[in-house]
Interface confidence: low
């Protein structure tokens, strides 16, 4: 646990008056319908709110939308619908907000059936002004910004054309027809799949993967027999149909598709799927679905090339393609991930890894909680976290787990304490050390959010009744104050705070309902006067992440290094501030076997750090496919975990020899790949 403080709850002085002076109500002159909210830029305070209302008439549906803008974090809104000529905006495309602080916004309008193309409204000044542009096509997808240049946009049309704009949507050019899926890569590269015969669906497994690095002037076919493709970190993945049957395999490239290697992962059949759960520049978590309608599969973790994989977790819950998985990256502490497994008795249990998938364990039981009815032994049980799967099953879980990179160590989640996830009403639990230890934070389900980099946690009870009370904590959830933000309760629909958890403003969204009408309303509360002063050096304390044995000089070593953080003391009521930067000090560790994954053909028996040869591969040459050549692997069973920075200590040897034989990969080999220019 992070450094503890006095257990007694010190109340924040005069908070009611301070918050009352900083609570701003805005009633929207709208019938209820739906509302969507987007933040434009970082630390700009600009929010766009789009309300839409459908009036079903006898023959058709008449739609009306309104656009509102705030530039003070939601305290005040101005109706700017006239800037978009009172046009009805298509909510399924959302508001396409440009990357970083570009200030760019694209809204896609609804147009009448007979029009030649769609219509967009573009802003490049944080929605102060909009330009109407008629499109030469009907968009099928939201406009996608190039991550490198926000002037470059791509979109697919309803007729499967790939359209590109180089001047932020002013002028559009169709660069390819018969396109199924398109994605921006790095350096303004576009990857896309094309069909040759009938349609995307009909050609699934016979698609071609193309690349253009010059926005459509020239193209290169980088793969054939493609089922689908994906990008993760520096890896490009494609699932490719096998020659002889209906199975498919994952191929991976780290050079934008110039060369490919077959990933050492099981092939999958027609009803199965692969899913990239998480990826960074070092490695990938890949889920491989089990045959049959099991609802689970296996998580594998890759090496640094994305080629050799280690089994990380069995029976990983993942319902169907595009279905539900609870896999969660805990962004507040390096190396930590949480997910669910489906046990033999079909109960669902939560597992956590602190070392990027090397080992998974159950979550420690919170000290202030009892084991529930699911526990066979009332003294021994674990915390189980509700995430996407529970939400999809309509359990009383309003929110997925929450963590923020700049609120170091903090994880908030709904959960139950027992042998498995319970269908009973969950409580809210908090960890202040990245998931090692947990405490019950709030009784019953709540919405929650983190403000001021962890300096404040805000929560609202999840209730079917109207609400008018918000709870807040200045000590990482140990003690809570309640504040009545309005006399007249509202039907609550959501909490909104600026992404990144640096803000001190929270917006409570809901609607009021009277006999005649219902209206959208928002209350924005600024907590700046609760945290009266800026935090000083004395308000922070040193905390060693991943510490489990303070006695050990190697304590806290994860992936070959440890990190000491400056953490805000729980007892300090002060502002981290918008410019707060996490202060951390890394130090390198000696290598141990824990810093190595088991190599291809090896596995780790449970509770053992040594890698042993897989019985079925004993005595066989280990051969695998690399860049279209067969390789011979001489190994003593270990390979360094991607991203591991350890030095010295144990050093298992690994050697790869080129067998100079071709692999039977279904990809075009690099020398046969064709290029063409427009």
């Amino acid at each position: 646990s992070a450094p503890g403080e006095d257990e007694e709850c010190g109340r924040v002085r005069d908070f009611v008056a301070k918050l009352a002076n900083n609570t701003h109500q805005h009633v929207f002159d709208d019938l209820r319908g739906s509302v969507s909210l987007s933040w434009v830029g970082d630390s700009t305070g600009v929010i766009l709110v789009l309300t839409t209302f459908h009036v079903p008439l006898v023959i058709m549906t008449f739609g009306q939308s309104k656009l509102y803008r705030s530039e003070d974090y939601g305290k005040n809104f101005k109706d700017i619908t006239d800037l978009i000529n009172n046009t009805f905006i298509r909510t399924e495309f959302g508001m396409a907000i440009g990357p970083e602080n570009s200030g760019k916004v694209v809204l896609t309008a609804e147009v009448s059936g007979g029009s030649r193309g769609g219509r967009i409204f573009r802003s490049s000044d944080f929605a102060k002004n909009f330009v109407q542009t008629d499109l030469p096509f009907h968009p099928l997808t939201q406009m996608m910004y190039s991550p490198q240049n926000s002037d470059y946009l791509l979109a697919l049309s309803t007729e499967n054309g790939l359209w590109v704009s180089k001047n932020f949507g002013g002028k559009w050019e169709e660069i390819h027809k018969a396109v199924c899926l398109a994605k921006w890569g790095s350096d303004n590269t576009i990857f896309f799949t094309t069909y040759a015969n009938g349609s995307c669906k009909a050609d699934l497994g016979a698609l071609e993967l193309w690349r253009t690095s010059d926005l459509g002037k020239s193209f290169k076919t980088i793969g054939v027999k493609i089922y689908s493709f994906g990008l993760g970190g520096r890896f490009l993945f494609a699932s490719v149909m096998a020659d002889k049957d209906t199975t498919r395999r994952i191929h991976v490239s780290t050079d934008q598709g110039d060369t490919w290697s077959m990933a050492q992962l099981p092939s999958v059949g027609q009803e199965q799927f692969y899913s990239i759960l998480a990826a960074n520049d070092d490695m990938v978590f890949m889920h491989v679905d089990e045959p049959g309608d099991t609802g689970f599969g296996t998580i594998f973790t890759s090496d640094d090339r994305g080629i050799v994989y280690s089994k990380s977790l069995d029976r990983h819950l993942y319902t169907t393609t595009g279905g539900e998985t609870d896999f969660t990256n805990v962004t507040s502490l390096r190396g930590v991930y949480i997910t669910s497994v489906l046990s033999e008795d079909n109960s669902i249990q939560t597992m956590i890894t602190f070392d990027q998938g090397g080992r998974w364990t159950h979550l420690r039981k919170p000290e202030n909680s009892e084991c529930d009815a699911t526990a066979k032994n009332k003294n021994e049980c674990s915390l189980h976290i509700h995430a996407s799967y529970s939400i999809s099953q309509k359990l009383n879980v309003p929110m997925a787990p929450l963590s923020e990179p700049n609120a170091v160590g903090i994880v908030i989640a709904h959960g139950s304490v027992g042998d498995a996830i319970s269908v009973m009403v969950p409580d809210v639990y908090i960890s202040d050390d990245g998931g090692y230890s947990w405490t019950k934070m709030l009784e019953g389900p709540h919405y929650y959010t983190i403000l001021d980099s962890g300096g404040i946690i805000v929560a609202i009870e999840h209730s079917s009744r109207p609400i008018n009370v918000i709870k807040f904590s200045t000590d990482e959830g140990q003690c809570w104050q309640t504040y009545t933000f309005t006399r007249d309760p509202i039907y609550f629909t959501g909490l909104a705070s600026e992404p990144g958890a640096r803000s001190m403003n929270i917006s409570i969204w809901g609607f009021t309902e009277s006999f005649l009408t219902s209206q959208w309303v928002s209350y924005t509360i600024d907590f700046k006067d609760i945290l009266e002063r800026n935090c000083e050096e004395k308000d922070y304390t040193i905390w060693l992440a991943h510490s489990t044995d303070p006695e050990d000089y190697e304590d806290g070593c994860i992936l070959g290094y440890k990190e000491q953080f400056l953490r805000l003391r729980k007892s300090s009521v002060c502002q981290n501030g918008r410019d707060y930067v996490v202060t951390k000090q890394p130090s390198i560790c000696l290598c141990s076997l824990e810093d190595f994954l088991c190599d291809f053909g090896y596995y780790r028996p449970e509770n053992d750090s040594k890698c042993v040869e897989q019985p079925e591969l004993k005595g066989h040459d280990l051969e695998f496919c690399l860049y279209g050549r067969e390789e011979h692997l001489t190994t003593n069973g270990y390979r360094k975990i991607p991203g591991d920075k350890c030095q010295g200590g144990v050093n298992p040897v690994r050697e790869v020899k080129d067998l100079k034989k071709k692999c039977t990969s279904n990809f075009l080999s690099p020398e046969k790949q064709n290029s063409k220019s427009n």
Epitope: P550, E551, Y553, E554, S587, G648
Partner: antibody, heavy 117, light 108 residues
């Protein structure tokens, strides 16, 4: 007030052994790592050994491994350095230092070890 | 092992002068560096830890700066009691935690 007092220094024959002690007071001894550092006459500081707070983990530079042994007795608030197979180049003032991790924040006054025939 | 290069090895200065001592390290040590002062016949005294943090009881004229591989100890206005030898030491990762060879600061 934090105090570290070394003792046990003196003259030792080449090949001989010596055991240095360091008595700690004024702080909670059993939660701190401790180190020995030496300084040959007219030379700079050289790190000799470190031991973790409970005595489980010990660290030495490669050139001293096998000849020097650091240990501690938390019940007695004491730190020790066992020197074996003494060599002329081991002649130095030996300091014990409290070592919380990122620095050696308190040092003893030192004890002189002379290896000579 | 990490190599520490301290410079200059000796330096003459007068009371009131601003003095800078540098420590260059063979690889990035991420600010895991301490500075010590040692007077003749005395034990070393910690001045700065974690590259920039002044230890308790150390006068404010001492300051530490730097990151990566280059670190500096600065004395803003030299006092008579500051004439001594100064050492840097890294604490990057696991041992050996090497010291710099020292800088002897003498009266001009």
């Amino acid at each position: 007030e934090v105090q570290l007092v070394e003792s046990g220094g003196g003259l030792v024959q080449p090949g001989g052994s010596l055991r240095l002690s360091c008595a700690a007071s004024g702080f909670t001894f059993n939660i701190y790592g401790m180190s020995w550092v030496r300084q040959a006459p007219g030379k700079g500081l050289e790190w000799v050994a470190t031991i973790s707070s409970g005595g489980i983990y010990t660290y030495y530079p490669d050139i001293l491994k096998g000849r020097f042994t650091i240990s501690r007795d938390n019940a007695k608030n004491s730190l020790y350095l066992q020197m074996n197979s003494g060599r002329a180049e081991d002649t130095a003032v030996y300091y014990c230092a409290r070592h919380p991790g990122g620095a050696m924040d308190y040092w003893g006054q030192g004890t002189l070890v002379t290896v000579s025939s | 092992d990490i190599q520490m290069t301290q410079s200059p090895s000796s330096l003459s200065a007068s009371v009131g002068d601003r003095v800078t001592i540098t420590c260059r390290v063979s690889e990035n040590i991420y600010s895991n560096l301490a500075w010590y002062q040692q007077k003749p016949g005395k034990s070393p005294k910690l001045l700065v830890y974690a590259a920039t943090n002044i230890a308790d009881g150390v006068p404010s004229r001492f300051s530490g700066s730097g990151s990566g591989t280059d670190y500096t100890l600065t004395i803003s206005s030299l006092q008579p009691e500051d004439f001594a030898t100064y050492y840097c030491q890294h604490f990057w990762g696991t041992p050996p935690w090497t010291f710099g060879q020292g800088t002897k600061l003498e009266i001009k």
